[in-house]
């Protein structure tokens, strides 16, 4: 009779996380009598996976009925595989004794676990930045195996090239993580832009995972201001508007100053949105020129998104020609000021009046 051999036909087996792994093992003889054991790893630190003779192994089932006569198939199935199960598994024949003694081992089957990467999480800078500045975005994905993985960055569908990627750990591990940092130059048109981190892995069957960050969370587009004097609406009244254009985000506070004194403060609420995602807003001030003897310096001061205020001034000249219309002149008279604001282009019939 030829001496028993332990045959493990598969050098390697690859299984997706969550599935069952079948590890094949047959012996070539019924002699010697004794149980089969399965181990992960070799040497004194090997881990017992299954012992035919004794023990409780809830995740392991035998593929064939080991109690049946002349059974020589000791293949096992391990359920609910996780990356932690990766390793080399040995089918070992023991010889009956007190205690049973190891007789012969199979050559081993390497189990590799294909684990999907987690959904990429993209995070941007803590503080907003303005156009022309370069900002960093990070992308992280975890828990994948094997180690080979591809990560790409896109901005609005255009692939980025300025990024650095690390896969950890460097050595062998049950699973891996990827971390990438991309540099993105902001433009004024980026409110609607998206930065996308795309991860491709063998487990994803050609359907990469994507993580996105909206640049609307990152960008601050400072407003441009224009102060203009409208034609006289009524005797002794001049309408001065402050056009606040192309700003983002919406958080904005506007203060009117007359000769340096605060006249009115308001917060942008109803705004118009531009196609590029920025906002426009207009505030107007009705000045009763009869109340002023001297020229009036009107200042539109805007504090945007908590940043230092920017302002634009307009000189309102007080002259002896009450009905003359012009950008810098108005009739001299006395009376109260009327102030107001509007987000409408046609201020004649849509504005609101506030009397003081």
């Amino acid at each position: 009779e030829e001496e028993l051999q332990v045959i493990q036909p598969d050098k390697s087996v690859s299984v997706a996380a969550g599935e069952s792994a079948i590890l094949h093992c047959t012996v070539t003889s019924l002699i010697p009598v004794g149980p089969i054991q399965w181990f992960r790893g070799a040497g004194p630190a090997r881990e017992l996976i299954y012992n035919q003779k004794e023990g409780h192994f809830p995740r392991v089932t035998t593929v064939s009925e080991s109690t049946k006569r002349e059974n020589m198939d000791f293949s096992i199935s391990i359920s609910n595989i996780t990356p932690a199960d990766a390793g080399t598994y040995y089918c070992v024949k023991f010889r009956k004794g007190s205690p049973d003694t190891e007789f012969k081992s199979g050559a081993g089957t390497e189990l590799s676990v294909r684990a999907k990467p987690s959904a990429p999480v993209v995070s941007g800078p803590a503080a907003r930045a303005t156009p022309q500045h370069t900002v960093s975005f990070t992308c992280e994905s975890h828990g994948f195996s094997p180690r080979d993985i591809t990560l790409k960055w896109f901005k609005n569908g255009n692939e980025l090239s300025d990024f650095q990627t690390n896969v950890d750990p460097v050595g062998e591990s049950v699973s891996y993580s990827i971390h990438s940092t991309a540099k993105v130059v902001l433009t004024r048109e980026d409110v609607h832009s998206q930065v996308i981190c795309e991860v491709a892995h063998v487990t994803l069957q050609g359907d990469p995972l994507r993580g996105t960050a909206n640049l609307s969370e990152t960008i601050r587009v400072p407003p441009t201001l224009e102060v203009t004097q409208q034609p006289v609406r009524a005797e002794n009244q001049v309408n001065v508007t402050c056009q606040v254009r192309k700003f983002y985000p919406q958080r904005l506070q506007l203060t009117w100053l007359e000769n340096g004194n605060v006249s009115r403060t308001e917060t942008a609420s109803t705004v118009t949105e531009n196609k590029d995602g920025t906002y426009n807003w207009m505030s107007w001030l009705l000045v009763n020129v009869s109340a002023h003897r001297d020229d009036v310096k009107l200042t539109c001061q805007v504090e945007h998104d908590g940043q230092p205020a920017v302002s634009k001034s307009h000189d309102l000249k007080v002259s002896a020609h009450p009905k003359e219309q012009g950008s810098n002149t108005a009739a001299e008279n006395t009376g109260s000021n009327e102030r107001g604001s509007s987000d409408y282009k046609d201020d004649d019939d849509k504005h609101h009046h506030h009397h003081h």
């Epitope: 009779e1 019924l30 009598v33 004794g34 035919q52 004794e54 109690t67 006569r69 002349e70 009956k96």
Partner: antibody, heavy 119, light 110 residues
Framework: QVQLVQSGAEVKKPGASVKVSCKAS????????INWVRQAPGQGLEWIAM????????HYNQIFKDRATLTTDTSTSTAYMELRSLRSDDTAVYYC????????????WGRGTLVTVSS | DIVLTQSPDSLAVSLGERATINCRAS??????????IFWYQQKPGQPPKLLIY???NLDSGVPDRFSGSGSGTDFTLTISSLQAEDVAVYYC????????FGQGTKLEIK
């Protein structure tokens, strides 16, 4: 190590039934067959039947097929052999034995249970 | 059913001498290249003990003065040098199909 501990001696009247137990330890009960063998005083060994505790598959010696029933309780790793319609010639030591190689052999034996059938 | 017949029924051998017990099957007990014959030793007041499995393989812990041979229908248990502790009844058993035992051979010291 493997141990098979059998229930104590029984005295039965003819026509009665006896149920002998065999509690296994030191191994996974459902992975190996249990055989039952008897030996009348001064006589040889007589195979009664065998059971696979994993699925309760049984094989009986034709002589005992109508009178013997093998069962197991996997929760307690115990095998049972019930013999009905006892006769005086059923007086014997009843052994349970575990088949370690699935060869239908008897590798480990219990110490035996003496069943005496007498009126 | 396969019937096993042992010979002799009893045997007396001097200490240190060879003892040979035969077992004949009514038909072949061979299957898949294996001879399904087993030998047991039973001492008074004790359960049987497996000595030899599949005709020629020594069970664990059994002294190597015991050996088994044969194939098909004819099998032999040999004790090469009888020791006092070998006094016992010896049984052959087959499992080619459902198990049966031989009638036993009583071994004594001459």
């Amino acid at each position: 190590q493997v141990q098979l501990v059998q229930s104590g001696a029984e005295v039965k009247k003819p026509g009665a039934s006896v149920k002998v137990s065999c509690k296994a330890s030191g191994y996974t009960f459902t992975n190996y067959w249990i055989n039952w063998v008897r030996q009348a005083p001064g006589q040889g060994l007589e195979w009664i039947a065998m059971i696979d505790p994993s699925d309760s598959e049984t094989h009986y010696n034709q002589i005992f097929k109508d009178r013997a029933t093998l069962t197991t309780d996997t929760s307690t790793s115990t095998a049972y052999m019930e013999l009905r319609s006892l006769r005086s010639d059923d007086t014997a030591v009843y052994y349970c034995a575990m088949d370690y190689g699935s060869l239908y052999a008897m590798d480990y034996w219990g110490r035996g249970t003496l069943v005496t059938v007498s009126s | 059913d396969i019937v096993l017949t042992q010979s002799p029924d009893s045997l007396a051998v001097s200490l240190g001498e060879r003892a040979t017990i035969n077992c004949r099957a009514s038909k072949s007990v061979s299957s898949s290249g294996y001879n399904y014959i087993f030998w047991y030793q039973q001492k008074p007041g004790q359960p049987p003990k497996l000595l030899i499995y599949l005709a020629s393989n020594l069970d664990s812990g059994v002294p190597d003065r015991f050996s088994g041979s044969g194939s098909g229908t004819d099998f032999t248990l040999t004790i090469s040098s009888l020791q006092a502790e070998d006094v016992a009844v010896y049984y052959c058993q087959h499992s080619r199909d459902l198990p049966t035992f031989g009638q036993g051979t009583k071994l004594e010291i001459k």
